[in-house]
Interface confidence: medium
């Protein structure tokens, strides 16, 4: 058990953890949750996780999608586990890309 | 309907020990955090002690550390606080609160428990 | 820890009259997600405490509308537009932005 006095009350989320900087954790906690994808490689990257520090959420929710890279931000308990970031593709497809999970 | 239980409370000599009970129905126990705040006779409310969801961080107020450990039974269901070294001034109504979340602290005390009495008296 | 203090100890009040309570922090609200965690709570005697307010000034479900919540900073303010027989009780403010987790020392209304 984990006894702790500290001053700041942080509001926490439990979030969804997918991904290579999870270890072998399959949730993390943070002040907001997020779903990423990005292509690496012509592979599609997908990953779950969460932000610890609120700043450095509020920078990368707030960055739009590009055809490289998308992230979905969100605040809630596991409000992470039912979303799929999505590239603005538009119609387009980027031929020789596949879905690819780290878990 | 969410529900939530004490019980425990009794007269105590000071520097006795008393463990209370809180029994949570009516939501998914474990999602969210517990919090125990209390009330002396005639008085305001005081917040005494928080624990999250899983049960791994856990939170008191200066008058609650080193001698007040909050602990949960999530297979039961269930919220304790273990009191040792009981005062005077720990006589009041002890209320289980929910928390907004599994790791949020106030903010969100809803819903609230109709309380157990602990008197310290010699 | 924060202090808070409410202002006044006592408010009697006419039936169909507004009402307000005042609540000050001892140093400012506003957590590091940049929201303002202070609540208030109404306990009718004999009762537990019930929520109202969440963050300033968000009514908590179910709560009638004649209840607002205002401020900033360290000045906050709780304000029933027209007090009926059953808002009689204790109201207390909380600030949850820090531990511990401190209230106000609740403000009495009652009806003239």
């Known amino acids: 058990m984990e006894d702790e006095k500290p001053k700041v009350n942080p509001k926490l989320y439990m979030c969804v953890c997918e991904g290579l900087s999870c270890g072998n954790e399959d949730h993390c906690e943070g002040q907001q949750c997020f779903s990423s994808l990005s292509i690496n490689d012509g592979f599609h990257v997908y990953q779950k996780g969460c932000f610890q520090v609120y700043e450095q959420g509020k920078m990368t929710c707030k960055t739009p999608p590009s055809p490289g890279q998308a992230v979905e931000c969100c605040q809630g308990d596991w409000c992470n586990r039912n979303i799929t970031a999505q590239l603005p593709t538009k119609g387009k497809s980027f031929p020789g890309t596949q879905n690819f999970h780290l878990e | 309907e969410v529900q939530l239980v004490e019980s425990g409370g009794n007269l105590v000599q000071p520097g006795g020990s008393l463990r209370l009970s809180c029994a949570a129905s009516?939501?998914?126990?474990?999602?969210?955090?517990m919090s125990w705040v209390r009330q002396a006779p005639g008085k305001g409310l005081e917040w005494v002690s928080g624990i999250t969801g899983n049960g791994i961080k856990t939170y008191y107020s200066v008058s609650a550390k080193g001698r007040f450990t909050i602990s949960r039974d999530n297979s039961k269901n269930t919220l304790f606080l273990q009191m040792n070294s009981l005062r005077a001034e720990d006589t009041a109504i002890y209320y289980c609160?929910?928390?907004?979340?599994?790791?949020?602290?106030?903010?969100?005390?809803?819903?609230w428990g109709q309380g157990t009495l602990v008197t310290v008296s010699s | 820890d924060i202090v808070m203090t409410q202002t006044p100890l006592s408010s009697p009040v006419t039936l169909g009259q507004p009402a307000s309570i005042s609540c000050r922090s001892s140093?400012?609200?506003?957590?590091?997600?940049?929201?303002?965690?202070l609540s208030w709570l109404h306990q009718r005697p004999g009762q537990p405490p019930r929520l109202l307010i969440y963050?300033?000034?968000n009514r908590f479900s179910g709560v009638p509308d004649r209840f607002s919540g205002s401020g900033a900073g360290t000045d906050f303010t709780l304000k029933i537009s027209r007090v009926e027989a059953e808002d009689v009780g204790f109201y207390y403010c909380?600030?949850?932005?820090?531990?511990?987790?401190?209230f106000g020392g609740g403000t009495k209304v009652e009806i003239k």
């Open positions: 140093q400012g609200l506003v957590n590091s997600d940049g929201n303002t965690y």
């Open positions: 609160v929910k928390e907004r979340g599994h790791s949020w602290f106030g903010d969100w005390f809803d819903p």
């Open positions: 009516g939501f998914t126990f474990s999602n969210y955090a």
């Open positions: 963050e300033i000034s």
């Open positions: 909380m600030q949850s932005t820090q531990f511990p987790l401190t």
